[in-house]
């Protein structure tokens, strides 16, 4: 598979915001890429999200994404919003190279985010 | 060495308190341990807290200790308060047998912590 | 247009070699990884080898069935993918096709193994 | 190794079926799956990449689907010209095994 490199591990900031880059190593030269981000947890595999996008162009996510990236070359920087406690997991970074043919797949070994739900502040009265 | 184990990565509440358990396979019958918290960070390697104690009896720290404990048996539930994000690292347990002879030391592989600092609450006006 | 030609098939006889030639043309030859794959009655298709491309190293990869016996080279300066196979058996028959990436194929080269 | 499992080695249908033929994969391969077409004296041709992208002239009556360890082809309203050996590959890692085929009779 073509690699795929992301950072082990992440740390969603306290608003629940979590950003990492997803670099891939392209053996030839694509003009539409296809990014998307799986949630492993408990062997179950999960789409987070999915953008195509043609290479100089921006990423376009669906409005109702919790995702939102950009890209620069061969490296997609990616930002996850919303994220609870409870969607702690590894989250795999999953790239295509869909046009001009051959397809090229590859998939990262997955940034484990970890997930801290904040205190809620004290009642202003 | 005397093996101790203790758990790869714990996530620090928002409240920026850590708590793991320090476990160690003794080869006798001793009436007196000591058990440090070290972290390595950057190569560097600190010393966070330590307290001896006799089987049976309390984990006692030193009043200004940012560390609390209980033991039982040959188990020790550490509690680490007051970290930042700056203090994520990875916390070591080391295990000293003190008495009665031989003297037996036990090193684990460390606990990384992962703090992450909480957004300011609005001010109250 | 793109052109995939295998030269190089034949009748050989068990444990003699024989070296398969593959001419790329009509895409960008060294941006492509080229595999080999060959199709029999008995097995239908069979994936047998991968070189990769520069970026890569040029790293290659084998199937079990092969490993060891059959090697696979490329020349980007000649558009060419090469597959050299020692040591063939009567289970090596079929038709070898070389194709980038499985995205373009050729027209095959039938390899006939027999005393 | 991934072992692919495909299914049913054969199948007969009339012209404007529907039909649909199914591969399973020991592991999850991450939608890394192709399908061909091959016809009798012909090269395979590459006819679904990705699971479920329709490659470039091929008729979309033609469509892939699924994820995971479950994959399928589905060719709507058959024709003569659909006659073929079609295989799945998958397209994740070494080695790139094909599964063993179903043969399509109309």
């Known amino acids: 598979a073509m690699h795929v490199a992301q950072p082990a591990v992440v740390l969603a900031s306290s608003r629940g915001i979590a950003s990492f880059v997803c670099e891939y190593a392209s053996p030839g030269k694509a003009t539409e890429v296809r990014v998307t981000v799986l949630r492993q947890a408990d062997s179950q595999v999960t789409e987070v999200c999915a953008a195509t996008y043609m290479m100089g162009n921006e990423l376009t996510f669906l409005d109702d994404s919790i995702c939102t990236g950009t890209s620069s070359g061969n490296q997609v920087n990616l930002t996850i919003q919303g994220l609870r406690a409870m969607d702690t997991g590894l989250y795999i970074c999953k790239v295509e190279l869909m046009y001009p043919p051959p397809y090229y797949l590859g998939i990262g070994n997955g940034t484990q985010i970890y997930v801290i739900d904040p205190e809620p502040c004290p009642d202003s009265d | 060495a005397m093996h101790v184990a203790q758990p790869a990565v714990v996530l620090a509440s928002s409240r920026g308190i850590a708590s793991f358990v320090c476990e160690y396979a003794s080869p006798g019958k001793a009436t007196e341990v000591r058990v440090t918290v070290l972290r390595q960070a950057d190569s560097q390697v600190t010393e966070v807290c330590a307290a001896t104690y006799m089987m049976g009896n309390e984990l006692t720290f030193l009043d200004d200790s940012i560390c609390t404990g209980t033991s039982s048996g040959n188990q020790v539930n550490l509690t680490i308060q007051g970290l930042r994000a700056m203090d994520t690292g990875l916390y070591i347990c080391k295990v000293e047998l003190m008495y009665p002879p031989p003297y037996y030391l036990g090193i684990g592989n460390g606990t990384q912590i992962y703090v992450i600092d909480p957004e300011p609450c609005p001010d109250s006006d | 247009e793109v052109k995939l030609d295998e030269t190089g098939g034949g009748l050989v006889q068990p444990g003699r070699p024989m070296k398969l030639s593959c001419v790329a043309s009509g895409f960008t030859f060294s941006d492509n990884w080229m595999n080999w794959v060959r199709q029999s009655p008995e097995k239908g298709l069979e994936w047998l080898a991968q070189i990769r491309n520069k970026p890569y190293n040029y790293e290659t990869y084998y199937s079990d069935s092969v490993k060891g016996r059959f090697t696979i080279s490329r020349d980007d300066s000649k558009s060419s993918v090469y597959l050299q196979m020692n040591n063939l058996r009567g289970e090596d028959m079929g038709i070898y096709y070389c194709?980038?990436?499985?995205?373009?194929w050729g027209q095959g080269t039938l390899v006939t193994v027999s005393a | 190794d991934i072992q692919m499992t495909q299914s049913p080695a054969s199948l007969s249908a009339s012209v404007g079926e529907t039909v649909t033929i199914t591969c399973g994969t020991s592991?999850?391969?991450?939608?890394?799956l192709n399908w061909y077409q091959r016809k009798q004296g012909k090269s395979p041709q590459l006819l679904i990449f990705g699971a479920t992208n329709l490659a470039d002239g091929m008729s979309s009556r033609f469509s892939g689907s699924g994820s995971g360890r479950q994959y399928s082809l589905k060719i709507s309203s058959l024709h003569p010209d659909d006659v073929a050996t079609y295989y799945c590959q998958n397209v994740l890692r070494s080695p790139f095994t094909f599964g063993s085929g179903t043969k399509l009779e109309i």
């Open positions: 194709t980038a990436q499985f995205a373009y």
């Open positions: 592991e999850n391969i991450y939608g890394g």
